[in-house]
């Protein structure tokens, strides 16, 4: 093993380097000193470092680490932010279209109901939107309220159109009769099932994406411990104290330090993998009754069928209601003629079918595919950070935290650090409280996602979940279907080009909380760049 070169007799190189890091030279010794007060860069002989310099190195090392972590997660973070925004907007558009379709159905088939029907339909779809965004509303109550509100209008406008104003106080009675007599048959129940299942899945999908953002934000803004700061300082900066300005850390040493510093973060890996796979399961199951696009856009048809059902049973119902709500009834039921086949104006509801056009379903699949690119993200972070900070290739003449060596030996390094900070201790400390919290949230959402995926009869790919990771993994840079009469009713295909309506591409500036995320400018984004090229080992 070659002896370390003698330290710079005047500390001149160290001074000029440190000045770029911290203007002013008051902390830098002019000539090598014993360095008995040093706590991190423990000297084997005279040193060009002081305690204050050590502190500055530690701060810089931690900032560099944070910056590297942020640059690593930039693409993944924007992917989720962008998609959460796109899907939220897309779901709003679906709700808006569904409301318009339902209103069009009333306008074209039951014009006498329109003023009130529009109001009730509007309230229903407002509740749908609020539910998707996480509001504490019961879907069954929403559907019940829609039909409770509609029936008195249907009764007074369609079934009994000549009722005098004095008879209109029967509304409460009619609302009650609606449920007791099951005047809409099983349609309200059918709608409850479809709407609640599809909205539940939609809501949890959005929740999962928002949690994804939270996970990245949490790890993105981790403050590394002082212990980690000491290890990073020893690896990146202590060589400077001996005047070894050009030497690089040993690759193996860097990996050990990063595994130690990021032990808590890497613990997220298992739950992150499960998160992506569970989200994929959910997305695979988002069709038919579990696809809000499909359900909500077909709702007008089911509501139309339910009104036809009432009309078919009008005679029977009127007699029964006449008895139930007798005190308010002023006249006998006078049946009006309604044609059997009530078609929706195809011009109003026609949805163009375009070959290969993009649907929410294809966009979801695309998101999952892209997310799967990042399934090993957390296990790869230590390797990414080592590969983005200078390390000696093949460990030839490299820095092991204490001295210049021909190759890194973990055992020797551990022995040499007996009196210093122990790498093993750092690993054993467990994750930071914020990391533990985010792991708990991931466990919770994974549980929810799995629960939601169960009815589809799919099982997570055990193979993928249980696969061991090779060391190289870190090394790079890196049921029911929708009911409906079908009698000539047009089916609204799941082919709306919503994504053409919304900003599919969401420019970087439009992404929430992402103003500078995608294109860091060398001179503005962080310490890592601000520190300049000379002193930073991370160039």
């Amino acid at each position: 093993q070659p002896p370390p070169p003698p330290p710079d007799a005047t500390c001149h190189q160290v001074r000029s380097f440190f000045q770029r890091l911290q203007p002013g030279l008051k902390w830098v010794p002019e000539t090598p000193v014993p360095g008995s007060d040093l706590q991190v860069c423990l000297p084997k002989g005279p040193t060009c470092c002081s305690r204050k310099m050590e502190e500055k190195y530690q701060l810089t090392a931690r900032l560099n680490m944070e910056q590297l972590l942020q640059s690593a997660s930039m693409e993944l973070k924007f992917l989720i932010i962008q998609n959460a925004a796109v899907f939220q907007e897309a779901f709003e558009i679906v709700v808006r279209h569904a409301k318009n379709y339902t209103n069009a159905m009333f306008k074209n088939n039951y014009p006498s109901l329109t003023p009130q029907a529009f109001e009730f339909v509007g309230e229903f779809f407002t509740d749908v939107s609020l539910y998707i965004l996480g509001s504490d509303i019961n879907v069954d109550d929403m559907v019940n309220e829609l039909f409770d509100s509609l029936f008195p209008v249907i009764y007074t406008q369609l079934m009994n159109p000549g009722l005098p104003d004095s008879a209109l106080d029967i509304n409460e009675c009619l609302r009650g009769a609606r449920r007791d007599l099951k005047v809409f048959g099983n349609f309200p129940k059918l709608i409850m099932t479809q709407v609640s299942k599809s909205l539940q899945v939609t809501r949890i999908f959005l929740q999962a994406l928002n949690l994804g953002i939270e996970v990245i934000n949490t790890t993105d803004h981790l403050k590394f411990s002082k212990d980690c700061g000491r290890m990073l300082t020893r690896m990146w900066y202590c060589s400077y104290c001996q005047g070894l300005m050009m030497v690089k850390p040993c690759g193996g040493y860097c990996n050990v330090v990063m595994q130690g510093c990021m032990a808590g973060v890497v613990e997220i890996d298992k739950y992150w993998r499960e998160y992506i796979l569970s989200l994929e399961e959910l997305v695979n199951g988002m069709y038919r009754i579990y696809d809000m696009e499909n359900v909500l856009l077909g709702l007008f048809s089911t509501i139309h069928d339910s009104i036809q059902y009432v009309q078919k049973n009008a005679g029977k119902l009127t007699t029964t209601i006449g008895k139930l709500c007798a005190h308010s009834q002023q006249r006998q039921y006078r049946s009006a003629y309604y044609p059997e086949d009530l078609f929706i104006d195809k011009k109003v509801l026609k949805v163009a079918h375009v070959e290969h056009e993009e649907t929410l379903s294809s966009r979801r699949r695309e998101l999952i595919q892209k997310l799967k690119s990042f399934i090993s993200f957390y296990s790869a972070l230590p390797g990414y950070i080592c590969s983005h900070s200078p390390v000696a290739e093949n460990d030839t003449l490299c820095w092991n935290g204490q001295e210049l060596v021909e190759r890194y030996s973990q055992k020797a390094a551990r022995n040499g650090m007996k009196n210093q900070f122990n790498l093993h201790e750092l690993k054993m400390k467990g994750p930071e409280p914020v990391v533990s919290q985010i792991i708990d949230k991931l466990k919770h959402i994974n549980q929810l996602l799995r629960t939601m995926s169960m009815p589809k009869g799919r099982v997570l790919d055990k193979n993928l979940d249980e696969e061991g990771f090779e060391s190289g993994d870190c090394g790079d840079d890196e049921d029911e279907c929708i009911g409906g009469s079908g009698d000539g009713m047009i089916k609204v295909k799941n082919q709306l080009r919503f994504l053409a309506e919304l900003a599919y591409d969401l420019d970087v500036d439009d992404a929430p909380g992402n103003s500078q995320q995608a294109t860091p400018k060398d001179n503005e984004i962080s310490t890592f760049h601000n520190l300049g090229n000379v002193h930073s080992p991370l160039k």
């Epitope: 690593a72 930039m74 693409e75 993944l76 924007f78 962008q82 993998r273 695309e366 595919q369 892209k370 799967k372 690119s373 990042f374 399934i375 090993s376 993200f377 296990s379 790869a380 990414y384 790919d461 193979n463 993928l464 696969e467 061991g468 990771f469 090779e470 190289g472 993994d473 090394g475 790079d476 840079d477 890196e478 599919y504 591409d505 969401l506 420019d507 970087v508 995608a518 294109t519 860091p520």
Partner: antibody
Framework: QVQLVQSGAEVKKPGASVKVSCKAS????????MNWVRQAPGQGLEWIGW????????NYAQKFQGRATLTADKSISTAYMELSRLRSDDTAVYFC????????????WGQGTLVTVSS | EIVMTQSPATLSLSPGERATLSCRAS??????LSWYQQKPGQAVRLLIY???NRATGIPARFSGSESGTDYTLTISSLEPEDFAVYYC?????????FGQGTKLEIK
């Protein structure tokens, strides 16, 4: 060290099929996408599609849909690209390239396999 | 599909000079852009991903930036080994697409 080693050059007749292999090492094969890209003589690069070896999920460029088939054998960490109904304009160097885990960009590439289609 | 247009097709410069390679996307790609280097007989190499992030082992003289749908690869001071063909690639929307390439040659 991540390595992608591809099978050797092939000469095929029009209408035939070719199957190119790509053996991966140095990383967890199942957990990254494997892309296939081709380059006709003197031309630029063209993406064929990708496969996720963990579950066999695939995505193809429309142009190659129905003619290219991407498969993977996890047990030997090898990805395959089969192209059927070969035409003379399929003569190209075919590359495999890995995506992930920090970017969807293609972080590592194979050395390429020349496929010549000639009668 | 998204069309990526690179310019110039050929760039003739001397070592030590600054090289600026351009790539324009036919529609927004939200910074999902990579740059690759290809030399004869060698594997293609990822230089920059997500517009501005240097890949493993890529020297600091390589940098990437964007302005709207225009993306730029800059090599601050050319080294002899930098003379090669450079491709940009978008991975915002399927199918992933490449530019036609810019050949950087010694003047």
């Amino acid at each position: 060290q991540v390595q992608l080693v591809q099978s050797g050059a092939e000469v095929k007749k029009p209408g035939a099929s070719v199957k190119v292999s790509c053996k991966a090492s140095g990383y967890a094969f199942s957990n990254s996408w494997m892309n296939w890209v081709r380059q006709a003589p003197g031309q630029g690069l063209e993406w064929i599609g990708w496969i996720y070896p963990g579950d066999g999920d695939t995505n193809y460029a429309q142009k190659f849909q129905g003619r290219a088939t991407l498969t993977a054998d996890k047990s030997i960490s090898t990805a395959y690209m089969e192209l059927s109904r070969l035409r003379s304009d399929d003569t190209a160097v075919y590359f495999c390239a890995r995506s992930g885990p920090i970017t969807m960009g293609f972080t590592y590439w194979g050395q390429g396999t020349l496929v010549t289609v000639s009668s | 599909e998204i069309v990526m247009t690179q310019s110039p097709a050929t760039l003739s410069l001397s070592p030590g000079e600054r090289a600026t390679l351009s790539c324009r996307a036919s529609q927004g790609i939200s910074n999902y852009l990579s740059w690759y280097q290809q030399k004869p007989g060698q594997a293609v190499r990822l230089l920059i991903y997500y517009t501005s992030n240097r890949a493993t082992g890529i020297p600091a003289r390589f940098s990437g930036s964007e302005s709207g749908t225009d993306y730029t690869l800059t090599i601050s001071s050319l080294e002899p080994e930098d003379f090669a063909v450079y491709y940009c690639q978008q991975y915002s929307k399927f199918p992933w697409t490449f530019g036609q390439g810019t050949k950087l040659e010694i003047k």
